[in-house]
């Protein structure tokens, strides 16, 4: 009788993460008597994956009865597959020996490859912000995928970036990788809506991609313009003087209005208007009495946003531009705020 | 060459249910995903949901989450779609088509189309 | 969802013109954009992909071009096997999305 053949028919095997893998063997001949273990990997450090006479494998399940006499279908199911169960899967015959089975003959082996999803793409900014003009980094970084093949893609504002650098690790085989991706983004005054997106697109994904987000909001600077403008007032001996604070980004911003170098008020924006372009314009305004003042007066708005070192705009008040109020002297000075 | 060969017309009652089949062959079936379109008569094309090969996850568009449902045959390279208790609004023609990935997720392979007319 | 709409749902067009189909969608799209050509009692046939880029096959008379919200499909010199009903999808995101088709008719 012809000598016993152990047939694994697979030589590989390709398994979606968290399926059922299922490796087939065969034996050709009932003889010699003696039971089928299952390992992964080859030599003296392979592991045991089952043993069809004694232990435990809760994972494993066989295809076919082996308690039956004649059984010589030797096939097993392993369930929930993940990456580490990647690798070459060997049916090995023993020859039932006294006090320990003899390994008899071992299948060619087959192949296990498992395909695993990317984990969702987490795309992160710089620590600071930035002001227009400046170019920032963007990181993304998705983990878990196998096979190694992967394409990443960069988007802002429905383009495509192209100033990027991408790495997938480890370079050589292993169950599963990462990638991880660096951008170069130059922000510009109208980014405040804007967003930089991160598209994975794996075999195991087909037809959606993965995509991570990174609002520009949270990165972006815009430094306030101001202007100072004098308008007069019913009141003769009166001037309105306004700072018009336009187009930041964020809204915190902290205003002092200066009368010849010294404080006046100090306030924070509050109400303000949102530009279609998200930055905000804010505006003060001071009510300043021209007949308590007997020299000009040098104005200063000075505006604080955002931490940053503060911003003015001066202007130069002429008293002698204003006739005297021929009535009794109201206040010195009214100052107020309009919110706009 | 890539095909994808569809099942012939079906005329059903109001209730019963249908299913077409979608072939596949010329390409590795579980690479790429199985998208299904809807186009009634004299109307536009309206995307369904479509397959993953590979994982056996089906994506429904709103419109066709309840009576609709997509399977796959694997070892055949067949994709199928079954419409339950049908009713009148489901006379269409109903396409099949391949999606691409990597960067294009679009449908590039498209079966013949299967007519359905619900009738009573 | 994205809402695709092809302005005109019909064009009455003379053989060797220039024709050009519009698709608008409701937000940005990032170029993944596809054209189909559909003739009566066949399934649609890809013609562009990726907003721009033309499938193998595909004439040449034949382009696509746009960006962000707005795309367009362009026919330098219209042939008599032109005549079809054309139409735009989004494929950025699901639900994917067909704009309302364009049908050309020779005058």
């Known amino acids: 009788e012809e000598e016993l053949q152990v047939i694994q028919p697979d030589k590989s095997v390709l398994v979606a993460a968290g399926e059922t893998a299922t490796l087939r063997c065969t034996a050709t001949s009932l003889i010699p008597v003696g039971p089928i273990q299952w390992f992964r990997g080859a030599g003296p450090g392979r592991e045991l994956i089952y043993n069809q006479k004694e232990g435990h494998f809760p994972r494993v399940t066989t295809v076919s009865d082996l308690t039956k006499r004649n059984n010589m279908d030797f096939s097993i199911r392993i369930g929930n597959i993940t990456p580490a169960d990647a690798g070459t899967y060997y049916c090995v015959k023993f020859r039932k020996g006294s006090p320990d089975d003899v390994e008899f003959k071992s299948g060619a082996g087959t192949e296990l490859s498992v395909r695993a999803k990317p984990s969702a793409p987490v795309v992160s900014g710089p620590a600071a912000r930035a002001t227009p003009q400046h170019t920032v980094s963007f990181t993304c970084e998705s983990h878990g995928f196998s096979p190694r093949d992967i394409t990443l893609k960069w988007f802002k504002n429905g383009n495509e970036l192209s100033d990027f650098q991408t790495n997938v690790d480890p370079v050589g085989e292993s169950v599963s990788y990462s990638i991880h991706s660096t951008a170069k983004v130059v922000l510009t005054r109208e980014d405040v809506h804007s967003q930089v997106i991160c598209e994975v697109a794996h075999v195991t994904l087909q037809g959606d991609p993965l995509r991570g987000t990174a609002n520009l909001s949270e990165t972006i600077r815009v430094p306030p313009t101001l202007e100072v403008t004098q308008q007069p007032v019913r009141a003769e001996n009166q001037v309105n003087v306004t700072c018009q604070v336009r187009k930041f980004y964020p809204q915190r911003l902290q205003l002092t209005w200066l009368e010849n170098g010294n404080v006046s008020r100090t306030e924070t924006a509050s109400t303000v208007t949102e530009n279609k372009d998200g930055t905000y314009n804010w505006m003060s305004w001071l009510l300043v009495n021209v007949s308590a003042h007997r020299d000009d007066v040098k104005l200063t708005c000075q505006v604080e946003h955002d931490g940053q070192p503060a911003v003015s705009k001066s202007h130069d008040l002429k008293v002698s531009a204003h006739p005297k109020e021929q009535g009794s002297n109201t206040a010195a000075e009214n100052t107020g705020s309009n919110e706009r | 060459q890539i095909q994808l060969v569809q099942s012939g017309p079906e005329l059903k009652k109001p209730g019963e249910t249908v299913k077409i089949s979608c072939k596949a062959s010329?390409?590795?079936?579980?690479?790429?995903?199985m998208h299904w379109v809807k186009q009634a008569p004299g109307k536009g094309l309206k995307w369904m949901g479509w397959k993953n090969t590979e994982t056996g996850e089906s994506t429904y568009a709103e419109d066709f989450k309840g009576r609709f449902a997509f399977f796959l045959e694997t070892s055949a390279s067949t994709a199928y779609l079954q419409i339950n208790n049908v009713k009148n609004e489901d006379t269409a023609t109903y396409f099949c088509?391949?999606?691409?990935?990597?960067?294009?997720?679009?449908?590039?392979?498209w079966g013949q189309g299967t007519s359905v007319i619900v009738s009573s | 969802d994205i809402q695709m709409t092809q302005s005109s749902s019909s064009f009455s067009v003379s053989l060797g013109d220039r024709v050009t189909i519009t698709c608008k969608a409701s937000e940005d799209i990032y170029n993944r954009l596809a054209w189909y050509q559909q003739k009566p009692g066949n399934a649609p046939r890809l013609l562009i992909s990726g907003a721009t880029s033309l499938e193998t096959g595909v004439p040449s008379r034949f382009s696509g071009s746009g960006s962000g919200k707005d795309y367009t499909l362009s026919i330098t010199s219209l042939q008599t096997e032109d005549v079809a009903t054309y139409y735009c999808?989004?494929?950025?995101?699901?639900?994917?999305?067909f704009g309302g088709g364009t049908k050309l008719e020779i005058k």
């Open positions: 010329g390409y590795t079936f579980t690479d790429y995903a």
């Open positions: 088509a391949r999606g691409g990935y990597g960067s294009n997720y679009v449908m590039d392979y």
């Open positions: 999808q989004q494929y950025w995101n699901s639900p994917r999305t």
